[in-house]
Amino acid sequence: EEELQVIQPDKSVLVAAGETATLRCTATSLIPVGPIQWFRGAGPGRELIYNQKEGHFPRVTTVSDLTKRNNMDFSIRIGNITPADAGTYYCVKFRKGSPDDVEFKSGAGTELSVRAKPSAPVVSGPAARATPQHTVSFTCESHGFSPRDITLKWFKNGNELSDFQTNVDPVGESVSYSIHSTAKVVLTREDVHSQVICEVAHVTLQGDPLRGTANLSETIRVPPTLEVTQQPVRAENQVNVTCQVRKFYPQRLQLTWLENGNVSRTETASTVTENKDGTYNWMSWLLVNVSAHRDDVKLTCQVEHDGQPAVSKSHDLKVSAHPKEQGSNTAAENTGSNERNIY
């Protein structure tokens, strides 16, 4: 009688993560008596995948009933496949022995390859905000995909970027892979509404790439431009001075009025107007009682934007043309948003 052969007809099997893998194996004879076992890998450290008689293998089921006396089909199904299951699987016939069963013959092996989708790309920008004309770096990461081949592209507002570097790890064989890419983006004043997009294409995605986005509103700081102007006299001895704070982002802004270097009033930007490009405008005004001053007054609008060093703009107010109003001790009156007097 011809010696038993263990036949694994499939050299390789490709399965998508989460699906069930069928590993086929048949024996050509019922003799010698003994169990079939499945292993991943070869050699002394091989991993037991299925033992017909002993052990706990909750993910494995047999294709046929192994208890049937004339059964020679030892195919198995492995459920809920993950990239960690990739490898070469061997169907091995044992013959009964004492004390332990003895390996008799092995199949040629079936290589299980697992296709796994990349995770949703995560895009992260710099820790600190940057101003227009500066170059900032964005990173994009995606994990857990297999096979290794993958394509990553960067876009800013739909326009493909070219200044980026991408790495796929590990370099050698692995059950799954990760991709890491860093793109350089030059900021412009119009970028408050801009988006940076990282797009990942992989064989498992069937032509429908995954995208991760970052809003440049989280990254950009547009410093304000200041303009201090003197308005026509509203009443005798009173001059209205305005400070126009234009085109700033984000909204966090504190304004201080100084009269001859002395703090007159501090306020925080609240009722701002938004420009089409996403930046903000704000205006503060100061009603100066010129009769309270003997000499010319230097009015300074000082703005601290988003925690940055203060910027300021000054305006010289001539008081010689105005007769001094007797008995007035009011230096300035706030007629801004909260209508309160400062003494």
Epitope: E47, L48, G55, P99
Partner: antibody, heavy 114, light 108 residues
């Protein structure tokens, strides 16, 4: 569901034999081995042996080889373990265990006392 | 035979603490054949971990297993009141199948 139901407690004299039964249900009895494990009072677990219900093939712990006999009756899906020449140190709870090591019988207390 | 030595014999801890139980084999055991059980008084053992590191069905994620060769570990990340019990490691890599002597995890 899978169940292994063992026979009741036994009190035996030294030198006697005891036969513990284990009736299986909820799975194909010939699928996997049935193991026998015992536990003396306040002690750990001790593997005694196993039987393959499909063909009656057995393996024993050398410590018990000459005293333990394991058998099966596939018509009733029942496994048996007989321990002979009992001594006081054989006082223990005896468990039958399915080959997957998940399903255990409730245990059978065997007391050996003169 | 492969002798499995568990340490410590007794572990006195409070609920919420981390428990680390060791199982050392006298000769190398392939991870696939190393199992852990929990046993409470008057009950049959219950399978916790199979193939050294895989959680059996219904076992909480605070239990984990690791190790290879001759050194294996069972870890309980944060002890719950119901975790105080005796724990056994077990090998079925070669005959005779053997169990460790057990580690009793008791309330401090």
């Amino acid at each position: 569901q899978v169940q292994l139901v063992q026979s009741g407690a036994e009190v035996k004299k030294p030198g006697a034999s005891v036969k513990v039964s284990c009736k299986a249900s909820g799975f194909n009895f010939e699928d996997t081995y049935i193991h026998w494990v015992r536990q003396a009072p306040g002690q750990g677990l001790e593997w005694m042996g196993r039987i393959d219900p499909a063909d009656g093939d057995t393996k024993h712990n050398p410590k018990f080889h000459d005293r333990v006999t394991m058998t099966v009756d596939t018509s009733t899906n029942t496994a048996y373990m007989e321990l002979s020449s009992l001594r006081s140190e054989d006082t223990a709870v005896y468990y039958c265990v399915r080959g997957n090591y998940v399903n255990w019988g409730q245990g059978t207390t065997v007391t050996v006392s003169s | 035979e492969i002798v499995l030595t568990q340490s410590p014999a007794t572990l006195s801890l409070s609920p919420g603490e981390r428990a680390t139980l060791s199982c050392r084999a006298s000769s190398s055991v392939t991870s696939s054949y190393l199992y852990w059980y929990q046993q409470k008084p008057g009950q049959a053992p219950r399978l916790l971990i199979y193939s050294a590191s895989n959680l059996a069905s219904g076992i909480p994620a605070r239990f984990s297993g690791s190790g290879s060769g001759t050194d294996f570990t069972l870890t309980i990340s944060s002890l719950e009141p119901e975790d105080f019990a005796v724990y056994y490691c077990h090998q079925w890599y070669s005959y005779p199948r053997t169990f460790g002597g057990g580690t009793k995890v008791e309330i401090k």
